[in-house]
């Protein structure tokens, strides 16, 4: 009696179970009563990453330098190429189909997490006692200068965008 279901890594065709093609190979012909499934390797720039019955392999992803992309990991017959972004840029999506320039943190904000090829810069507001006076994709919030340790006094209070201004202590005249 012809099967109605097949084992893992098999498929049902013409009332018989045929082996699927292994990753890295495409289907040429279904199995027959005389021969097993005919599969052939994917070509130079192609891949198939699962046990399959695909009659064509997929093309490797192209990392287009015009979109700021470069190859992070070269594809094989069983894996797709992985793209990432050039220095200073990050992917716009998980699929990494294009790149945008890393965001800079404005004055009053510091870098909490530096951007990577796949994630943008994360900024945080400088808390009391810290400041950032530049727009930067790398600079963290800096602590205000401690006037006391320099034997100076605060002449102008700091903000989240400016450091304190220190000055000499006023000496009391005798």
């Amino acid at each position: 009696e012809p099967p109605t279901a097949c084992r893992e890594k098999q498929y049902l065709i013409n009332s018989q179970c045929c082996s699927l093609c292994q990753p890295g190979q495409k289907l040429v012909s279904d199995c027959t009563e005389f021969t097993e499934t005919e599969c052939l390797p994917c070509g130079e720039s192609e891949f198939l990453d699962t046990w399959n019955r695909e009659t064509h392999c997929h093309q490797h992803k192209y990392c287009d330098p015009n979109l700021g992309l470069r190859v992070q990991q070269k594809g094989t017959s069983e894996t797709d190429t992985i793209c990432t972004c050039e220095e200073g840029w990050h992917c716009t999506s998980e699929a990494c189909e294009s790149c945008v320039l890393h965001r800079s943190c404005s004055p009053g904000f510091g870098v909490k997490q530096i951007a990577t090829g796949v994630s943008d810069t994360i900024c945080e507001p400088c808390p009391v006692g810290f400041f950032s006076n530049v727009s930067s994709a790398f600079e963290k919030c800096h602590p205000w200068t401690s006037c006391e340790t320099k034997d100076l006094v605060v002449q102008q209070a700091g903000t989240n965008k400016t450091d304190v201004v220190c000055g000499p202590q006023d000496r009391l005249r005798a």
């Epitope: 065709i13 097993e36 005919e38 390797p41 009659t55 064509h56």
Partner: antibody, heavy 116, light 111 residues
Amino acid sequence: QLQLQESGPGLVKPSEILSLTCTVSGGSISSSSYYWGWIRQPPGKGLEWIGNIYYRGDTYYSPSLKSRVTISVDTSKNQFSLKLNSVTAADTAVYYCAKGFRFDYWGQGTLVTVSS
Amino acid sequence: QSALTQPPSASGSPGQSVTISCTGTSSDVGGYNYVSWYQQHPGKAPKLMIYEVSKRPSGVPDRFSGSKSGNTASLTVSGLQAEDEADYYCSSYAGSNNLVFGGGTKLTVLG
């Protein structure tokens, strides 16, 4: 049982076009096998791969014949065809059609003579 | 791509074993496990005897076996019989949906 049958003129003049058709019976050209091929054999010589076609039309040709060969498919007639341009006496051969790249089913072959 | 190299002839007496070689390169025989062997009797179409180096289609006697080492594939016919007298051709996948055949070997059964 799958059967393949080549057909076409047995005599072609030099510089003309050799045209052959392979008719598949006992199965569909677009299922069971998805790729189909042509092979030839000059009298008293060995087998030579000419090319293959995917049932949706993609073609793969022998580098040595690529500039002169065209393989096409007609799924409605369950046929695929071979055209070879600018033939010479060296193209005189028995031409076979076959299934897949493994060639587990063959036509019986047809002799094409190139002569004026 | 060049044709695979086969000896033009081979022979053996009934009951003996004979081995036919098929030598290619790392781009064909050595690069893929896609070697096939065909038997062709005079005036007939070739018949698939071995595929994927060593697999036999059902119906082909187990006297026929295939193997591969490096860039050379081999077909062994053991327990030779008169009906084994024929031409034998190897073929190999050569990448990028290309195939290449060997030049053929005429097998003679003596006696």
